[in-house]
């Protein structure tokens, strides 16, 4: 698993990056776990990074990801007093120069090394869900979310609002 120090070195001063022509609103480090409290971990294997969903041993440190928050350039349909309709998007980076990517063809979630500007596949619309959980919807494929399948992350199509509560697309973010 990546050491936290590597990620902390990577944490940048606010506004010094330009992704899709915009800067992040803010960035911070958090650990990512599933609804069932399994940890999302990252490991270097055969010169590529793998993503695992696993139970950690008692004193094992959780991997951290750098969450970068962006406002969408396109508003949602919601309107009314005070709301401007823009949605909150995130990118997730567990180590320098690597970001989670949605591979819509393979229905997979992968870690890709890339330069800025990041491709749209690295952006996810943030959803609030029940039990203080969040979900991550692909910017490139609305209705498709990051989810857990066979102890790996995968892309899961959600075809109705009732299915939005399915446990395998629910995640917890912890800044501690």
């Amino acid at each position: 698993a990546f050491g936290i120090s590597g990620v902390q070195k990577y944490t940048r001063a606010l506004h010094d990056s330009s992704i899709t022509g915009i800067s992040p609103i803010t960035e911070y480090l958090a650990s990512l776990s599933t609804y069932n409290d399994q940890s999302i971990t990252f490991a270097l294997e055969d010169e590529s990074y793998e993503i695992y969903v696993e139970d950690l041993k008692k004193d094992e440190k959780k991997d951290k990801v750098l969450l970068s928050y962006y406002e969408s350039q396109h508003p949602s349909n919601e309107s009314g007093d005070g709301v401007d309709g823009k949605m909150l998007m995130v990118t997730l980076s567990p180590t320098k120069d690597f970001w989670l990517h949605a591979n819509n063809k393979e229905h997979s979630v992968e870690l890709h090394k890339c330069e800025k500007p990041l491709p749209d596949q690295a952006f996810f619309v943030l959803h609030n869900m029940h039990s203080n959980c969040v979900s991550f919807e692909c910017k490139t494929d609305p209705g498709v979310f990051i989810g857990v399948k066979d102890n790996h992350l995968a892309l899961i199509k959600v075809d109705s609002s009732e299915n939005l509560c399915t446990e395998n697309i629910l995640f917890k973010l912890s800044e501690t």
Epitope: I25, S76, G85, K86, M87, V134
Partner: nanobody, 119 residues
Framework: QLQLVESGGGLVQPGGSLRLSCAAS????????MGWYRQAPGKQRELVAV???????NYGDSVKGRFTMSRDNAKNTVYLQMNSLKSEDTAVYYC?????????????WGQGTQVTVSS
């Protein structure tokens, strides 16, 4: 829907202090990001401070060490303590929340409160 109401603005001398408040009311109870922005006449709106759901706070370069953002979860209120104010801090200050109960996280703005730093 969500209403954000700012208060605490006014006229203050250079070197003085002000405390801004922003109270959120309405049906939204989960906020992912809370922040303060400001806009001076003829300038773009700029980030002053932003706080995450877990309490991590980042500040704009021009206010670091002088401004402090805090919150009171029980009152759904955020604060901006502004010390050592300078004339260049004169602006309309806006409260900014990102939140939702269920579904995509959306952005909300307050109406703004005027801060004037002048002798």
């Amino acid at each position: 829907q969500l209403q954000l109401v700012e208060s605490g603005g006014g006229l203050v001398q250079p070197g003085g202090s002000l405390r801004l408040s922003c109270a959120a009311s309405g049906s939204i109870f989960r906020f992912n990001l809370m922040g303060w922005y400001r806009q001076a006449p003829g300038k773009q709106r700029e980030l002053v401070a932003v706080m995450s759901e877990g309490g991590t706070t980042n500040y704009g370069d021009s206010v670091k060490g002088r401004f402090t953002m805090s919150r009171d979860n029980a009152k759904n209120t955020v604060y901006l303590q502004m010390n050592s104010l300078k004339s260049e801090d004169t602006a309309v200050y806006y409260c900014n929340f990102w939140g939702s109960n269920s579904g995509p996280v959306l952005q909300y703005w307050g109406q703004g409160t005027q801060v004037t730093v002048s002798s």
